[in-house]
């Protein structure tokens, strides 16, 4: 079925939201971010088998062409469909400031 | 450099727009599309090395975490940043109809 949510590869193997714990050092942010000290990064990881969570017509085309020309056309890729905002306390020239980043944490995922 | 357009892997190896010629049969559209008979499908293909065409903060995080945990976190993926519309002449219950698809042909690409 188009845009299906059933993973034919087995539970948890297909494109879905994962959480990865990362320190400011891991992210390369230690020199400009004060808080939070650790981030639960939500990201989209997993395989995109035929029509699984296909984002749009382009993803459906990509699936078809990947099946025909796997060496030329890659399979669709698991990427964020939307994001949650995150507020950082960051260093500025004048001190510190709150800054909202709208594109930092994945909220849900699809294949494209 | 962040969001850089220089490909460190060599010309044409990094995320960019490619054109793949496909017939209606290739796309699985022969039973519902009358025209065009052949589509020049523009799609995003190529590697996403560190910070190359990083779409947003999430892509930058993904690059950092992939470097640290390559078995857990995949590298960013080359996907459409925007689309060109395409008009299909398609079969309907009552005959034929023109239909515009806004999400069919990639216009430009980024890494996410």
């Amino acid at each position: 079925a188009r845009n299906g949510d059933h993973c034919p590869l087995g539970p948890g193997r297909c494109c879905r939201l994962h959480t990865v714990r990362a320190s400011l050092e891991d992210l390369g942010w230690a020199d400009w971010v004060l808080s939070p000290r650790e981030v639960q990064v939500t990201m989209c990881i997993g395989a995109c088998p035929s029509q699984f969570r296909a984002a749009n017509m382009h993803a459906q085309i990509k699936t078809s062409l990947h099946r025909l020309k796997p060496d030329t056309v890659p399979a669709p890729c698991c990427v964020p469909a939307s994001y949650n905002p995150m507020v950082l306390i960051q260093k500025t020239d004048t001190g510190v400031s709150l800054q909202t980043y709208d594109d930092l944490l994945a909220k849900d995922c699809h294949c494209i | 450099a962040r969001n850089g357009d220089h490909c460190p892997l060599g010309p044409g190896r990094c995320c960019r727009l490619h054109t793949v010629r496909a017939s209606l049969e290739d796309l699985g559209w022969a039973d519902w599309v009358l025209s065009p008979r052949e589509v020049q499908v523009t799609m995003c293909i190529g590697a996403c090395p560190s910070q190359f065409r990083a779409a947003n903060m999430h892509a930058q995080i993904k690059t950092s975490l992939h470097r640290l945990k390559p078995d857990t976190v995949p590298a960013p993926c080359c996907v459409p940043a925007s689309y060109n519309p395409m008009v299909l002449i398609q079969k309907t219950d009552t005959g034929v109809s023109l239909q515009t698809y806004d999400d069919l042909l990639a216009k430009d690409c980024h890494c996410i």
Epitope: S35, N84, V87, I89, T94, G95, S97 | -
Partner: antibody, heavy 121, light 110 residues
Framework: EVQLLESGGGLVQPGGSLRLSCAVS????????MTWVRQAPGKGLEWIGI???????YYASWAKGRFTISKDSSKNTVYLQMNSLRAEDTAVYFC???????????????WGQGTLVTVSS | DIVMTQSPATLSVSPGERATLSCQAS??????LAWFQQKPGQPPRLLIY???TLASGIPARFSGSGSGTEFTLTISSLQSEDFAVYYC????????????FGQGTKVEIK
């Protein structure tokens, strides 16, 4: 000299609205976050919210919906718009520079003297 | 919502003695914490920021410690001018940002 001066306080009836101003001098509002804090008579301090240098706003959950922080950088003024006022909103309202839990470079302690808002019929 | 809880509500101490004030956060706020002193009719005065950094012009008898959810303000040897109300302020950031003061600790002469 760096200064903050609140104004706009006074007597207002329950259900009414009031806009407080915090005029700043000696620094640019585009470079600093600004915090509003209030204190009811004989009570403790209460954090209301912040407007960042870039203009993003953050509020205490109890203030969301009724209180709005804004600024006019050209007038060097931060505002606190208060709607649907209740007797329990009676307090001295302070503005302060920065997010307070981390000091700005330079002056570490910059608060206005406060303006009294009384909500009563 | 972040909640900051201070204890004790009142602390009776003799001049020259040590005073220890506690502040607990309902969320992990890392070091996003400040301590303020307030006297009647005055705005609050910043003593400690980033949980443990002494603000400029503040005597070294004041010190702060802690991280995460548990914080302490210590006044090593109370002077007469130190009798006042002390507040902690925490700021929690993640998907949004919110601050909250503790209810205050009154340090009075024993």
């Amino acid at each position: 000299e760096v200064q903050l001066l609140e104004s706009g306080g006074g007597l207002v009836q329950p259900g009414g609205s009031l806009r407080l101003s915090c005029a700043v001098s000696g620094f640019s509002l585009s470079s600093y976050d600004m915090t509003w804090v209030r204190q009811a008579p004989g009570k403790g301090l209460e954090w209301i919210g912040i407007i960042s240098g870039s203009g993003s706003t953050y509020y205490a959950s109890w203030a969301k919906g009724r209180f709005t922080i804004s600024k006019d950088s050209s007038k060097n003024t931060v505002y606190l718009q208060m709607n649907s006022l209740r007797a329990e909103d009676t307090a001295v309202y302070f503005c302060a520079r920065g997010i307070l839990v981390y000091a700005d470079y330079g002056d570490h302690n910059l608060w206005g003297q406060g303006t009294l808002v009384t909500v009563s019929s | 919502d972040i909640v900051m809880t201070q204890s004790p509500a009142t602390l009776s101490v003799s001049p020259g003695e040590r005073a220890t004030l506690s502040c607990q956060a309902s969320e992990d706020i890392y070091t996003n914490l400040a301590w303020f002193q307030q006297k009647p009719g005055q705005p609050p005065r910043l003593l400690i920021y980033a949980a443990s950094t002494l603000a400029s012009g503040i005597p070294a008898r004041f010190s702060g410690s802690g991280s995460g959810t548990e914080f302490t303000l210590t006044i090593s040897s109370l002077q007469s001018e130190d009798f006042a109300v002390y507040y902690c302020l925490g700021v929690y950031t993640y998907i949004s940002a919110e601050g909250a003061f503790g209810q205050g600790t009154k340090v009075e002469i024993k």
